[in-house]
């Protein structure tokens, strides 16, 4: 099985032309688009990638690029306006020459005598670098996503093909297939390859069946497989959970809404460092777990798991992964305990009475929207957030 990719070597989702033999196809890729089949055109010059000149970008070059990338024909070719003002117009007669510095920054052009990639060549310093970039949207604008998994790195696998998002059948779906998905999406490596019904079923077409990746492919659609067959239903939609996906649980409390904060990330459960665990982080976690709001942040215990995760939230985020976060890969939380939280929906808040003391019922309003009934206010000290 392929070993997990180190987190600092996660691939991006732009179309990598290194897959081609030198001279076999165009050294081009598309970046900053909605998929690997749309975006700004970049050409490879020795060791670097440079944006292709927009001034010399035409429909023949656009068609050739789309075909070379396996994205069908070109649907739309355009120039991206420069981010800064364009260069001044040609110098008036008598002005001193600016060629010495202007040409050094010349941009490469992809020049094609026809719509076939064999008829194209990259010409260096073909344009002044006025900031105009060549852009293209290809007809087969393919893309990939994971949906309904609580984040961009987990969920039901969906491919965009021929303008429609559709599922992948789980027949023969395994970790190698999920690896390709995770790497393509910049989500690390696959932690789980899941069969149907782990996530909500899809509604669109089923684009692929019998997918059989080696694990080395750059894109899911490069893997061997069959078109989606009629006998494959949405109960069999393939899913994946990638290493960069985060999920949370509370452990060691009365129920799932109280306890030590643990995050599943990069294949293992980790505790969270309480040195940066404040009311805003606790509030986001309780709400994302469906546990109401945070009522208390009990003093933490020593880390029972490797504690490497820190969060910093403003309190309005939907999940902790939407907050600013960092995962310290080399050191455990220094001089901190494991973060803990008590959420308002925990049943431990409703079982605080003691037989000796008559129950006096008091209503406490927290965060102006959550009402909690507490019997015998002396029996438990609440830290209101």
């Amino acid at each position: 099985h392929p070993s997990p990719a180190p987190p600092d070597q996660l691939n991006t989702s732009s179309a990598e032309s290194e897959l081609w033999e030198p001279g076999e196809r165009l050294p081009v890729r598309l970046t900053n688009g909605s998929s690997s089949c749309s975006g700004t055109v970049e050409v490879r010059l020795e060791a670097s990638w440079e944006p292709a000149c927009g001034a010399l970008w035409d429909s023949r070059a656009a068609e050739a690029v789309c075909r070379a990338l396996g994205c069908g024909g070109a649907e739309a070719a355009s120039q991206l306006a420069p981010p800064t003002p364009e260069l001044p117009p040609p110098p008036a007669a008598g002005n001193t020459s600016v060629a010495a510095n202007a040409t050094l920054a010349g941009a490469p052009a992809l020049l094609c005598s026809g719509a076939e990639w064999r008829l194209c060549e990259v010409v260096e310093h073909a344009c002044r670098s006025d900031g105009r970039r060549a852009r293209v949207t290809c007809a087969e604008n393919r893309a990939l996503r994971l949906v309904d998994g609580g984040g961009a790195c987990a969920g039901r696998v969906e491919m965009l093909e021929h303008g429609e998002w559709g599922s992948v059948c789980d027949d023969t779906w395994d970790l190698e297939d999920a690896h390709v998905v995770c790497r393509q999406l910049g989500c690390g490596w696959a932690v789980q390859a899941l069969p149907g019904l782990h996530f909500t079923p899809g509604r669109g077409p089923i684009h692929r069946d019998q997918v059989n990746c080696s694990g080395a492919e750059a894109y899911l659609w490069d893997c061997p497989g069959l078109p989606g067959q009629h006998y494959c239903g949405h109960k069999e939609d393939a899913g994946a959970v990638c290493s960069e996906h985060q999920s949370w649980r509370l452990t060691g409390g009365a129920d799932r809404c109280e306890g030590q904060v643990e995050v599943h990330f990069r294949g293992v459960w980790n505790t969270v460092c309480d040195s940066e665990w404040y009311p805003s982080e606790a509030k986001v976690l309780c709400q994302s777990l469906g546990c109401g709001t945070a009522v208390e942040r009990p003093k933490g215990l020593p880390h029972s798991l490797s504690g490497r995760m820190y969060y910093s939230c403003n309190g309005e985020e939907l999940t902790l992964s939407n907050c600013s976060w960092r995962f310290n890969n080399s050191n455990l939380c220094s001089q901190s305990l494991a973060a803990r939280v008590l959420c308002s929906a925990s049943r431990s808040l409703h079982n605080l009475s003691t037989p000796e003391v008559p129950a006096s019922v008091q209503t406490v309003t927290i965060e102006s929207s959550v009402t909690v009934k507490i019997e015998n206010k002396e029996s438990r000290e609440l830290m209101l957030l």
Epitope: P90, A93, V98, A99, A102, T103, A109, R128
Partner: nanobody, 123 residues
Framework: QVQLVESGGGLVQAGGSLRLSCSAS????????LGWFRQAPGKEREFVAA????????YYADSVKGRFTISRDNSKNTLYLQMNSLRAEDTAVYYC????????????????WGKGTLVTVSS
Amino acid sequence: QVQLVESGGGLVQAGGSLRLSCSASERTFSDYALGWFRQAPGKEREFVAAINWVGGSTYYADSVKGRFTISRDNSKNTLYLQMNSLRAEDTAVYYCVASWGAMPVLTHVINYWGKGTLVTVSS
């Protein structure tokens, strides 16, 4: 205003050679990418060859690759087109062009056109 004046055209036998020149009035000649277009009788104007500002990059139409060579001498404000192994289909009026923003491969980037010089290749 850049004045471009072509010379060197004429009648030549198929298989022969010619060298076209284009001189420019502009002192800032080296600020322009230069090229050649041609127009045969009854046909559309077509790209032939182009060269960038300092002469480090060139580009040719497929029909002339390996036979024609474009070059420039910035100290003389002159552009050249060396044409070898001429064919009857090379017969056309040849235009010198200058472009500020990009190599003059597509007509929409061209700032200045010369008046042209006629090349006739007899078979």
